[in-house]
């Protein structure tokens, strides 16, 4: 390409940076930016809180305080004033069946005879075989087990209670939480006599025969938990301590890493497109066609055709053959990128304090979920209870006549009905009121706000990194001219002037994403319908959403950048950072590319190191540890090993998205630094020696001859 | 075939017992629980007792208890029913009844399936 | 204990009727009432048992219903082999007991 050609390229994005003597990294004399952005969030807030106070007032806290029994009347209030702990006579239907939209609407509810009680069960037990032609006088009250529902008669028979769920079917030793009774983490739970595999106990209990065969899963996962939590933590700090070291490591085996991964990747190619060739020949022997095959929806079929494995090998041959133009014809910009690597690695041992950041961006998204769970939950929790009638098993004999979900009163349970457990339950509130009414509007604005916010917290990460990584970049002698607390003193600058900004690039996100949202819920409802052509909108909807979201990350990053090095405004910066990445375009591609491949190369050593190590220790596999190290026992020692994959997964994404933040800002204060200085005395580069070295540029030296130390 | 024969029944004073039998065939008399009902001459059914499958459980109408025992001898297939002190108005015709309930189907409980054909109890002095 | 009370305590019919008698608990007995036929002098035969659902062998011209405190057995059409004693009885709370029973005969 031309040089002439590539000025006309780079003028249709802008004119390069001008030499600007003053500019010395991130500007100090800033003025806030996107002020009426600013105000509008900030009012945004204020009205969000307003939501929060509102949600309190009318909201029901006794429903997320106090527990309620089946018939909807509190524990430890009123007629239940010394039965203050609530007993599930299957807890375990409450885990199968509870999550954060039933949660949000009716409280911690579940599918099972609920009862208020003075003290949770202490011992476990079970109904006995030989129990249950006894009476509910003999088997519970006498035994000091008073679980069953109010008013069951002393005299009646054991199994017709269970049967219409009056009394529960086994006992716990539960302990109170938020005015449960919660089962102890390390309880066994006893043999249920009588019951064989394929018969399911009554329908009280049939989510625990099924899970289980009379043990629940959940039970198990509990001890798991408690026994190996140490462990998990230990795999969690190794995850930690694998990150820093990878990243670290970066300055001195980034080249090297970087070649074999990039060679990794053409010999995975190349296996493929041999793959392809031996799978074409064979089928292509026996003649086998797609004209044979005809049209099928069965895509399994297509396996068995050659033009499959011909097509294959044509994407697989092209995508190897771009590889290798690229490793010949770019391999400068792999170079550079290579060395910004590099520098990213050394920057961030410099600041090993951005490295924690992350932590703080955690906190800032967790109270922004707390906060709008809260306030959902309560905004759901106002109005009126409603209760309607419900059934554990629809499908008993003499639940076909009854309507199930129609309204009832509590007070007045349901016990002429051939329907066994049919009870009048909680539903939800009534829609009653100015605040009822305005419900949905306020949940949404509640949507709104936690979209918003969330996308801010993320923004002020970006930008205080940014700002941090930037004050490196642009300290003429390093380790010296980085300011004292980069980290801090970025924050505070972002949190200052910039707010209104990151709040502009937020609000952009948010409205896609919301988009998104909507379109996924019109998509879901849409599930059933047929519609080709519906589909194929949807889907192409859902494709041109997907990626303004992916351009929008990207734009903002930058833009945020921009802001923390320039302090102007979110469009000025946004148009800045495109235009200055557009007129390096293929630079920006390969760094990309090559980032992503040694980042992901990063993640995956870390998870598989930690999961190799979880899985030899947590399996007992490794051998001769001391008695400190011994492996605990474990039910399921897979549990442990999934959960420290995950750990991992979440401490090296937090870590390497820092670096990636660190890559991203080095990289456009690199190429603002070849535009804006031509390494003479009056205008030297910032950039490292070997980016020099790479770009065949070099600094003036001084008169004296002495040579600036880098 | 299922099948219940009472035997045991006559006639016999105020005061003094009698022991009615149930000889059970056909099924797993081990497996179910047992009823006795009896039915004054001209008069409707009343219930009198169970035993469960396995004989540790019992219950008894209140115009009986203290004064009839039931039992069960699982290894003869047989169910008992001891009178003592016994009184006119326990002259009835005594059924034996099976019950549907074996202690393993937890899902139902169903009551009385098959009766026998009785036996007399006469108590006159 | 519970008291089972039955309507009509008799009642007249013929042949080809549709005839229904109505059982009464004097508390919640759920859905746990059976109904036996007996006819002079032999021994009473069950016919239905969880209020509605019919033994095996028992013809489909009987139903019941009914739960709680109130139910009822219907016959759909009464043949001659149907003149009978019709009695209903709890089996959920000791001491079981049986109601006073309904007599069907011939109009």
């Known amino acids: 390409m031309g040089g002439k050609q590539r000025d006309k390229d780079d003028e249709a994005y802008g004119k390069p940076v001008k030499y600007d003597p003053s500019f010395r990294g991130p500007i100090k004399n800033r003025s806030c930016t996107d002020v009426i952005c600013c105000v509008l969030f900030l009012l945004f807030i204020l009205g969000y809180i307003v939501v929060g106070i509102v949600a309190w007032l009318y909201g029901d806290p006794r429903q997320v305080l106090y527990p309620r029994n089946s018939t909807g009347a509190y524990c430890g209030m009123g007629e239940n004033k010394d039965k203050p702990y609530l007993l599930y006579f299957n807890i375990f239907s409450c885990i199968l069946s509870t999550n954060i939209i039933s949660v949000a609407e009716n409280g911690l509810q579940c599918p099972t005879p609920q009862v208020c009680v003075s003290s949770c069960p202490e011992d476990p037990w079970t109904v006995g075989k030989n129990q249950f032609s006894q009476t509910v006088g003999e088997v519970f009250y006498t035994k000091n087990r008073n679980f069953c529902l109010p008013g069951v008669p002393w005299n009646m028979m054991v199994i017709t209670s269970l049967q219409q769920e009056l009394c529960p079917s086994f006992l716990l030793p539960s302990a109170p939480a938020l005015g449960r009774c919660f089962p102890w983490t390390n309880v066994t739970l006893p043999e249920l006599p009588g019951i064989t595999n394929d018969t399911t106990i009554a329908q009280g209990i049939s989510g625990l025969i099924d899970s289980l065969n009379a043990r629940d899963i959940s039970v198990k996962i509990f001890e798991d938990f408690a026994h190996s939590w140490y462990w998990i933590l230990v795999a969690l700090g190794v995850a930690l301590l694998l990150s820093l070291l990878f990243i670290l490591l970066l300055r001195l085996v980034a080249g090297p890493l970087v070649l074999v991964l990039i060679l990794g990747v053409l010999g995975v190619l190349a296996y493929g497109i041999y793959y392809c060739w031996e799978e074409y020949r064979v089928l292509r022997d026996k003649g086998a066609s797609i004209s044979q095959l005809g049209f099928t929806t069965n895509l399994s079929a297509y396996q068995s055709v050659q033009e499959t494995w011909l097509a294959a090998l044509i994407v697989l041959a092209v995508l190897e053959a771009i590889l290798l133009l690229v490793l010949i014809f770019l391999r400068q910009r792999i170079r550079i990128a290579i060395a910004l690597l590099k520098e990213a690695s050394k920057a961030v041992g410099q600041m090993m304090s951005t490295m924690f950041y992350p932590l703080v961006t955690f906190v800032l998204l967790l109270i922004c979920i707390a906060y709008w769970a809260m306030t959902a939950l309560y905004l759901a929790t106002s109005g009126q209870p409603q209760y309607v009638l419900w059934a554990s098993n629809i499908s008993s004999p003499g639940c076909e006549k009854v309507s199930i979900n129609t309204s009832c009163n509590p007070m007045d349970q349901p016990v002429n009905s051939s329907c066994p457990g049919l009870m009048c339950v909680f539903q939800g509130y009534s829609s009653k009121g100015l605040v009822q009414r305005s419900l949905f509007n306020l949940q949404i604005y509640g949507v709104l706000g936690l979209f918003w916010t969330l996308n801010w917290v993320l923004a002020l990460g970006q930008c205080v990194l940014a700002g941090a990584f930037a004050s490196f970049y642009w300290a003429f002698h390093k380790p010296q001219d980085i300011p004292t607390f980069p980290l801090i003193s970025a924050f505070i600058r972002t949190l200052r002037y910039h707010t209104g900004s990151l709040a502009f690039g937020a609000l952009i996100l948010t409205l896609v994403q919301i988009a998104r949202v909507i379109l996924e819920y019109i998509d879901h409802k849409l599930r059933g319908v047929q519609n080709p052509v519906a589909r194929c909108i949807m889907c192409c909807f859902k494709c041109c959403l997907w990626c303004l979201e992916k351009f929008i990350k990207f734009l903002n990053r930058n833009a945020y950048i921009m802001i923390a090095i320039y302090g102007k405004n979110f469009c000025v910066s946004a148009k800045n950072a495109f235009t200055l990445l557009m007129r390096n375009i293929v630079r920006v591609v390969v760094l990309d590319k090559v980032t992503d491949l040694l980042l992901f190369f990063g993640k995956l050593l870390v998870v598989g190191g930690v999961g190799v190590l979880s899985f030899f220790f947590f399996s007992g596999r490794i051998q001769g540890l001391g008695r400190d190290f011994k492996s605990p026992h474990l039910n399921y020692y897979w549990l442990p090993i999934m959960t420290s994959i995950m750990g991992a997964y979440v401490i090296a994404s937090g870590f390497f998205s820092v670096f990636g933040m660190c890559v991203d800002t080095l990289f456009l204060c690199f190429l603002e630094d070849l535009e804006r200085n031509d390494g003479s005395l009056d205008r030297p580069y910032y950039m490292s020696k070997s980016l020099l070295k790479i770009l065949g540029k070099k600094n003036e030296a001084p008169p004296d001859n002495k040579k600036r130390k880098k | 075939q299922v099948q219940l024969v009472e035997s045991g029944g006559g006639v016999v004073q105020p005061g003094r017992s009698l022991r009615l039998s149930c000889a059970a065939s056909?099924?797993?008399?081990?497996?179910?629980?047992m009823h006795w009902v009896r039915q004054a001459p001209g008069k409707g059914l009343e219930w009198v007792a169970v035993?469960?499958?396995?004989?540790?459980?019992?219950y008894y109408a209140d115009s009986v208890k203290g004064r009839f025992t039931i039992s069960r001898d699982n290894s003869k297939n047989t169910l008992y029913l001891q009178m003592n002190s016994l009184r006119a108005e326990d002259t009835a015709v005594y059924y034996c009844?099976?019950?549907?309930?074996?202690?393993?189907?937890?899902?139902?409980?169903?009551?009385?399936?098959?009766w026998g054909q009785g036996t007399t109890v006469t108590v006159s002095s | 204990d519970i008291q089972m009370t039955q309507s009509p305590s008799s009642l007249s019919a013929s042949v080809g009727d549709r005839v229904t008698i109505t059982c009464r608990a004097s508390q919640v007995i759920y859905n746990y009432l059976a109904w036996f036929q007996q006819k002079p002098g032999k021994a009473p035969k069950s016919l239905i048992y969880g209020a509605s659902s019919l033994h095996s062998g028992v013809p489909s011209k009987f139903s019941g219903s009914g739960s709680g405190t109130e139910f009822t057995l219907t016959i759909s059409s009464l043949q001659p082999e149907d003149f009978a004693t019709y009695y209903c009885?709890?089996?959920?709370?000791?001491?079981?007991?049986f109601g006073p029973g309904t007599k069907v005969d011939i109009k």
């Open positions: 009885q709890q089996y959920t709370i000791y001491p079981f007991s």
């Open positions: 035993i469960w499958y396995d004989g540790s459980n019992k």
């Open positions: 056909g099924f797993t008399f081990s497996s179910y629980g």
């Open positions: 009844a099976r019950d549907r309930y074996s202690g393993y189907d937890y899902y139902y409980y169903y009551g009385m399936d098959v």
